[in-house]
Interface confidence: low
């Protein structure tokens, strides 16, 4: 199987020599993104409702810390690089950590400027691979040089770094946020009313992956045959998962006997009509 | 409508460079990976490797690290095959396609470019 | 890297009756297996994936089955336009990686 791994995405930029204070940054977990660093506000936050709903407030109060003293790096790297002329310019890192199925682990970053690569670092040997371009050599050369200068930047410091990594990517995996191909869906169900004493119940379910689902109706716990409900295609949402509904009509007063049933990659759950108009129920995203 | 338009054939000769590129519309490029397939005269689809256009992380397949370079420039939505010094054996179509953010396999594709190197 | 070994390399049948193409993975795949399909002068157009599940827009007399390493492409009742090479592609390890394909021509 693809190991595991977490991969932070941090960026600086520079206008006219002069760095930019802040930084831009987003974190993925096994290919999917879980955080983002809101420049406003100058914290690390949830991306996507599975991290916000498995990770505690602690996370990002951690995350933030690191992102911010790695921000700082980053921006005191980007300001010793000679090369600097007016414009835009932008300093790239991203590190990733990986476990593999054999419990080896791998760590690395990669540093671009201007969006072109021109070191990787292998933090576990220490070990940097610089392509043959002139300006590659040049800015590659330039950061080493400046790191060297820096007494913290020793192997420990590498090798501390990638231990961090790896804490972090064991406790995520634990959380068991790390959702590797299977995203449970949201389910709401809502009512509308219609005319006499009838009302309509819709049941949706979103944000979901694989596409396989079950959603239905059910009375007294007995599913309703197919002909007394409607269903919606299940339809990619454009963010590479899907979402579906099904509706029925029923009795006003009758609404405590209907419950929306969802099957979904092994995991499943009945939903009540809600009493009031809309109700708004969370599957719990379990992997 | 979805789509992915590849750059038109290349003749070339070897030793000679050369980017193709692929661009995407009708969709958000910057949330689904783009991967690129070659397919040699006659032959069956080989996985090269992949772009996330949002953030320009790449995998390649190992037999082909080293060989091209995959980038994007999502500011025009295109992604980029591209090699330094090209040998008769790249001669193929090579297609670009798109696959989700939660790797499902590549749903829409180019029309392909075909690449011809021969001296 | 896992190896997809397709079965037959081709198939020679008329319209209207059923194909059962083979995929057979080196080792465990999961689930994870899709089938496309490619015509001559044409991309790749993907057809199942997840083993079984079929893509936006493709006729129900495709079907996909199996889990671990042996699956299946069933096309119940061939239509003209059915004659075309067949891929299985795995998407459980990286890199991900395609079967030779298998032809399947009119008889």
């Known amino acids: 199987a693809e190991p595991h791994s977490l991969r932070y995405n941090l960026m600086v930029l520079s206008q006219d020599e002069s760095v930019q204070s802040g930084f831009l940054a987003e974190g993925h977990l096994d290919g999917q993104p879980f955080l983002r660093y809101d420049r406003q506000k100058r914290r690390a936050k949830p991306q996507g409702q599975w991290a916000e709903d498995v990770l505690g407030a602690k996370t990002w109060d951690t995350e933030t810390e690191d992102l911010t003293e790695n921000g700082q790096d980053l921006r005191r790297t980007l300001t010793h690089i000679k090369d600097q002329k007016g414009g835009l310019h932008s300093l790239q890192e991203i590190r990733v950590c990986e476990i593999h199925e054999d419990s080896s682990t791998r760590g690395s970053r990669h540093f671009y400027y201007d969006g072109e690569l021109f070191l990787s670092q292998n933090l576990e040997t220490q070990e940097s691979t610089v392509p043959q371009s002139s300006r590659a050599q040049t800015l590659a050369m330039n950061v080493t040089n400046f790191w060297k200068e820096d007494a913290m930047k020793t192997k420990t410091h590498y090798r501390a770094m990638q231990a961090d990594c790896l804490q972090k990517l064991q406790r995520y995996l634990k959380s068991g946020v790390a959702i590797r191909r299977t995203v449970p869906p949201m389910v709401n169900v809502t009512c509308s009313e219609v005319s006499e004493g009838n009302i309509t119940v819709t049941c949706r379910a979103s944000s979901f992956y694989p596409r396989n689902i079950t959603l239905t109706w059910r009375q007294d716990g007995v599913s309703l045959s197919h002909n007394t409900q409607q269903w919606g295609d299940v339809l990619p949402d454009g963010n590479g998962t899907y979402q579906t509904w099904v509706a029925t009509r029923i009795r006003q007063g009758e609404e405590q006997r209907f419950t929306c049933y969802m099957e979904h990659s092994g995991n499943h759950g009945t939903h009540p009509v809600p009493s009031g108009k809309v109700l708004v129920l969370q599957s719990q995203r379990t992997d | 409508e979805v789509q992915l338009v590849q750059s038109g054939a290349e003749v070339k000769k070897p030793g000679e460079s050369l980017k193709i590129s692929c661009k995407g519309s009708?969709?958000?490029?910057?949330?689904?990976?783009i991967g690129w397939v070659r397919q040699m005269p006659g032959k069956g689809l080989e996985w090269l490797g992949i772009?996330?256009?949002?953030?320009?992380?790449?995998r390649y397949s190992p037999s082909f690290q080293g060989q091209v370079t995959i980038s994007a420039d999502k500011s025009i939505s295109t992604a980029y095959l591209q090699w330094s010094s090209l040998k008769a054996s790249d001669t193929a179509i090579y297609y670009c396609?798109?696959?989700?953010?939660?790797?499902?396999?590549?749903?829409?594709w180019g029309q392909g470019t075909l690449v011809t190197v021969s001296s | 890297e896992i190896v997809l070994t397709q079965s037959p390399a081709t198939l020679s049948l008329s319209p209207g009756e059923r194909a059962t193409l083979s995929c057979r993975a080196s080792?465990?795949?999961?689930?994870?297996l899709a089938w496309f399909q490619q015509k001559p002068g044409q991309a790749p157009r993907l057809l199942i994936y997840?083993?079984?599940n079929r893509a936006t827009g493709i006729p129900a007399r495709f079907s996909g089955s199996g889990s671990g390493t042996d699956f299946t492409l069933t096309i119940s009742s061939l239509e003209p336009e059915d004659f075309a090479v067949y891929y299985c592609?795995?998407?459980?390890?990286?890199?991900?990686?395609f079967g030779q394909g298998t032809k399947v021509e009119i008889k």
């Open positions: 396609a798109r696959e989700g953010i939660a790797a499902t396999p590549f749903d829409y």
């Open positions: 009708g969709y958000s490029f910057t949330n689904y990976w």
């Open positions: 772009i996330h256009p949002g953030d320009s992380y790449t």
């Open positions: 080792q465990s795949v999961s689930s994870y």
């Open positions: 997840d083993a079984s």
């Open positions: 592609q795995q998407r459980s390890n990286w890199p991900p990686t």
